[in-house]
């Protein structure tokens, strides 16, 4: 991937809007299509007062762990969907788009250097275990995807890109 492409806000914006579209297509989290089993996903909540004061390396660890778990979750959802009778075509399309989007984002983050933080977390902070929750509907899964991109990922890339510009 071209260096620092993730720092172009339009790139992340495209994935955010795709995630939002996927969420909308699942017709609300109460009555939308259910997953045949619960899937573990990252907790996307951000306490921005604390997040703002985290070292960018610590943010990278949280983002990378979240991205990995989210990728696993959507691949798991794809497998469950493949085994279901008559999977809705539009849902399938959005699962495929999400998988493709997460792969691209993973590559773009690698260029930004997020992965090396995971390999060697800063000494001062042994990364806290990632907080997780479960999704039981496709809507909740896509909502987590959307929240993760808009929240931790966007906040981290904003800070990492700003630092790179200095």
């Amino acid at each position: 991937a071209p260096p620092r492409l993730i720092c172009d806000s339009r790139v992340l914006e495209r994935y955010i809007l795709e995630a939002k579209e996927a969420e909308n297509v699942t017709m609300g989290c109460a009555e939308g299509p259910r997953l045949s089993e619960n899937i573990t996903v990252p907790d996307t909540k951000v306490n921005f007062y604390a997040w703002k004061r985290m070292k960018v390396e610590e943010q990278a660890v949280e983002v990378w762990q979240g991205l990995s778990l989210l990728s696993e979750a959507i691949l798991q959802a794809q497998a469950l969907q493949a085994n279901s009778s008559q999977p809705p075509e539009s849902l399938q399309l959005h699962i495929d788009k999400a998988i493709s989007g997460l792969r691209s984002l993973t590559s773009l983050l690698r260029v930004l250097g997020a992965q090396k933080e995971l390999m060697s977390p800063p000494d001062a902070t042994q990364a806290a275990p990632l907080r997780t929750l479960t999704a039981d509907t496709f809507c909740k899964l896509f909502r987590v995807y959307s929240n993760f991109l808009r929240g931790k990922l966007k906040l981290y890339t904003g800070e990492a890109c700003r630092r790179g510009d200095r």
């Epitope: 809007l17 996307t44 951000v46 306490n47 007062y49 703002k52 909740k140 929240n147 929240g151 904003g158």
Partner: antibody, heavy 123, light 109 residues
Framework: QVQLVQSGAEVKKPGSSVKVSCKAS????????ISWVRQAPGQGLEWMGG????????DYAQKFQGRVTITADESTSTAYMELSSLRSEDTAVYYC????????????????WGRGTLVTVSS | SYVLTQPPSVSVAPGKTARITCSGD??????VHWYQQKPGQAPVLVIY???ERPSGIPERFSGSNSGNTATLTISRVEAGDEADYYC???????????FGGGTKLTVLG
Amino acid sequence: QVQLVQSGAEVKKPGSSVKVSCKASGGTFRSYAISWVRQAPGQGLEWMGGIDPISGFADYAQKFQGRVTITADESTSTAYMELSSLRSEDTAVYYCARELYYPGTWMAVMAYWGRGTLVTVSS
Amino acid sequence: SYVLTQPPSVSVAPGKTARITCSGDNIPEYYVHWYQQKPGQAPVLVIYRDNERPSGIPERFSGSNSGNTATLTISRVEAGDEADYYCQVFDESSWHWVFGGGTKLTVLG
């Protein structure tokens, strides 16, 4: 039921300071950030800053940086907003708002509000 | 910093549908929250995360966010809906909460 009870109205001289309190009841005080929002007469809402009681970290809107201090006292479940170097344009109703994570949100929103404290700055 | 623009006023007849808009650059990239404020009272959250309703808020209130505009829709408007309405987003670049200028909803008649 979450309730935020704010201190009473204040009249202050230009150049002085005011400290408004906001006492929370219901729910765990330390679990939720408190924001302060002000509203000048006939005007819209303006975020001043907020505090995370767990860490004690506070953040302020650029406009108020250096003039506002937000603190929280966990023992009394009370948040405070102090504004210094008051001028007539600071005449406003000052609200505290407790943030809450609704299901499916990555960011807390201002779910509960105090009734407001009118601060009048006049010589 | 990020700017949200709302029309200063909207008028609607009782029983009709009111639409209050809030525009900003790339607004679909943000989650939009809406507050209702009646005269002399504190604001009340009526919609969060574009289109979700907190408990206790009537189903008549709904929200959407696409294009360059977020919209608060109030169907079957009642006299009690007369109030100021504010949109709000969290601007990640400045780490600030940002409010729109507010829209005064007047219920005619």
